[in-house]
């Protein structure tokens, strides 16, 4: 099966790498614009220069292209706790990230929110916090893991999944209740 190519890909494939086919004359291959620039005017003829202009402030192109406009710089999402790691330049988009001791949780492929790494109180660190993953905790005896926090077994209800982990404690509590003084 031949993969379906879009019109632009079909046109580009006729020219050697680093060139694109002139939109009005398919016998002409124009040189693509360097990153940090965009296409202002197509080359007038074979072997003649493409008119490329530098991206204006607040816009960029990160690779060679024949775009009629530069791309708008991304803005870091403050409401997601994001901070700017590096500013947008003409050839690179803004890089957003999280503060120290935070990790990213992705709500979608391109949208992340910053959260504080778990400290594993009443437990130990099994896996350290990473850029895209919270700390993995192992809880001490008498505690169970709930939403990656170590919670006392005294908060374990019989209907919850913690019953297996907290079974001795639950039995002890039950035994204490049953052995009332007469």
């Amino acid at each position: 099966l031949v993969p379906h190519l879009g019109d632009r890909e079909k046109r580009d494939s006729v020219c050697p790498q680093g060139k694109y086919i002139h939109p009005q004359n398919n016998s002409i291959c124009c040189t693509k614009c360097h990153k940090g620039t965009y296409l202002y005017n197509d080359c007038p003829g074979p072997g003649q220069d493409t008119d490329c202009r530098e991206c204006e402030s607040g816009s960029f192109t990160a690779s060679e292209n024949h775009l009629r406009h530069c791309l708008s710089c991304s803005k870091c999402r403050k409401e997601m706790g994001q901070v700017e790691i590096s500013s947008c330049t003409v050839d690179r988009d803004t890089v957003c990230g999280c503060r120290k001791n935070q990790y990213r949780h992705y709500w979608s492929e391109n949208l992340f929110q910053c959260f504080n790494c778990s400290l594993c109180l009443n437990g130990t660190v099994h896996l350290s916090c990473q850029e895209k993953q919270n700390t993995v905790c192992t809880c001490h005896a008498g505690f169970f893991l709930r939403e990656n926090e170590c919670v006392s077994c005294s908060n374990c209800k019989k209907s919850l999944e913690c019953t297996k982990l907290c079974l001795p404690q639950i039995e002890n509590v039950k035994g204490t209740e049953d052995s009332g003084t007469t």
């Epitope: 949780h105 709500w107 979608s108 929110q113 959260f115 919270n134 939403e147 990656n148």
Partner: nanobody
Amino acid sequence: EVQLLESGGGLVQPGGSLRLSCAASGFTFDAYNMFWVRQAPGKGLEWVSAISPSGRETYYADSVKGRFTISRDNSKNTLYLQMNSLRAEDTAVYYCAKRYPDFDYWGQGTLVTVSS
């Protein structure tokens, strides 16, 4: 077949509370972020809240922060939205959804009307 069924909407006075539920089936519920979105009369969709598979990570739109609480019970395949201190501007059809931003699956919605 993926199904999401919202319930719990109704008419409530300003300052009142409601708890919405969303029963999910047909997919591995505890593997997905889940979302509440709403649509006020004559307006577009607004992303209200989100919760991660474990329930540890949550997101709230500024308009509902401090008043709404999202939660989930993976053992019951159910998503919840506790809504307190309701305002007239919270009047909308509330939908639960999986996946953002395309919200590939969502329910039929439940209408919340805040009026005196």
